[in-house]
């Protein structure tokens, strides 16, 4: 099939990507699976411009992104290089805090109420954002 030229219904197009913003919460792994079932991935933030776009749509609400360090180093779910890529952590974050009493540290990244990032317990039921590149959004042409 041909490349898609528009985003699915209820998704928002921005800079050749399609974004879906949840209005309910899930744990990070469940949100990740949700995006995968949509042929997408948790949002990968690669620029200040993309950060501002996402921040505008989610508002001041804790929201998962596709960044985690569950296997050691911080990794983006789509393979984007973390070390050389865009970052927007809150001061003194990530801190892998153990003081929450839930067991373990903090291995999943989310947007905080001011848009900057924090690491948190992956089981917390936060909202999330899915992203898919426009030319990967479907193998179908747009409906006429």
């Amino acid at each position: 099939g041909s490349e898609r030229t528009c985003c699915p219904v209820n998704w928002v197009e921005h800079e050749r990507s399609c974004y879906w913003f949840s209005r309910s919460g899930k744990a990070w792994a469940d949100a990740d699976n949700y995006c995968r079932l949509e042929d997408a991935h948790l949002v990968v933030v690669t620029s200040w411009e993309e950060q501002k776009f996402v921040q505008h749509h989610i508002g001041p609400v804790n929201t998962w992104m596709g960044l985690h360090d569950q296997n050691g180093p911080w990794k983006w779910v789509d393979g984007t290089d973390y070390e050389t890529g865009f970052k927007n952590w809150r001061p003194e974050q990530p801190d892998d805090w153990y003081g929450h009493g839930l067991g373990g540290g903090e291995d999943c990244a989310h947007f905080t109420d001011d848009g900057r990032w924090n690491d948190d317990v992956c089981q917390r039921p936060y909202r999330w954002v899915c992203e898919t590149e426009l030319d990967k959004a479907s193998q179908e042409p747009p409906l006429l």
Partner: antibody, heavy 118, light 107 residues
Framework: EVQLLESGGGLVQPGGSLRLSCAAS????????MSWVRQAPGMGLEWVSA????????FYADSVKGRFTVSRDNSKNTLFLQMNSLRAEDTAVYYC???????????WGQGTLVTVSS | DIQMTQSPSSVSASVGDRVTITCRAS??????LAWFQQKPGRAPKLLIY???SLQSGVPSRFSGSGSGTDFTLTISSLQPEDFATYCC?????????FGHGTKVEVK
């Protein structure tokens, strides 16, 4: 009108294989994830598997993982469930379902009966 | 896996009655809950999704409520066509799981 029509069920011996099909119409098939759900005689519903619209991501219940494979042919608007190493406890009516908004199972086929018995 | 426990397993009621069915999740599923109706020999039919949203074409006498772990399906005034089995489903986490069902039968 959304229509889902399962086929391929029947009687098979333990250890045998069967391939179920689900022909879909009335919606843009490739844009929707799809699921298989089964119901043993007189029992409740059990989710079996799900597959994303382009087929790149699949999910399975532990009870069928490694034995069942879900796939799809978007050019033919058809969903498949390849069932291997079948057991008596796999006996059930198998339904295919369309995953709609937020992945809710909004349309179901009428089901096909799979009986695993010697 | 998340277990979904429905109660009662059956309820006897008359046309016009208000019927309430409950579903309890073994862990927090926020609002990722659906309700289905199934009649003998038929496929399940989606009634309610996201805990309280009414599926298109479903009569307004059906309503859903709850959050977290405790959920309710209410039929405000039972109609003859409502005698069936009702079950809940969570889609918060894989594997998606269903309740065992509540049969609404004629008193």
């Amino acid at each position: 009108e959304v229509q889902l029509l399962e086929s391929g069920g029947g009687l098979v011996q333990p250890g045998g294989s069967l391939r179920l099909s689900c022909a879909a119409s009335g919606f843009t098939f490739s844009r929707n994830a799809m699921s298989w759900v089964r119901q043993a005689p007189g029992m409740g519903l059990e989710w079996v598997s799900a597959i994303s619209g382009r087929g790149g991501n699949t999910f399975y219940a532990d009870s069928v993982k490694g034995r069942f494979t879900v796939s799809r042919d978007n050019s033919k608007n058809t969903l498949f469930l390849q069932m291997n190493s079948l057991r008596a406890e796999d006996t059930a009516v198998y339904y295919c379902a369309k995953n709609g908004r937020e992945q809710w199972l909004d349309y179901w086929g009428q089901g096909t009966l799979v009986t695993v018995s010697s | 896996d998340i277990q979904m426990t429905q109660s009662p397993s059956s309820v006897s009621a008359s046309v016009g009655d208000r019927v309430t069915i409950t579903c309890r999740a073994s862990q927090n599923i926020t609002n990722w809950l659906a309700w289905f109706q199934q009649k003998p020999g038929r496929a399940p039919k989606l009634l309610i999704y996201t805990t309280s949203s009414l599926q298109s074409g479903v009569p307004s006498r059906f309503s859903g409520s709850g959050s977290g772990t405790d959920f309710t399906l209410t039929i405000s005034s039972l109609q003859p066509e409502d005698f069936a089995t009702y079950c809940c489903q969570q889609t918060n986490s894989f594997p998606w799981t269903f309740g065992h069902g509540t049969k609404v039968e004629v008193k």
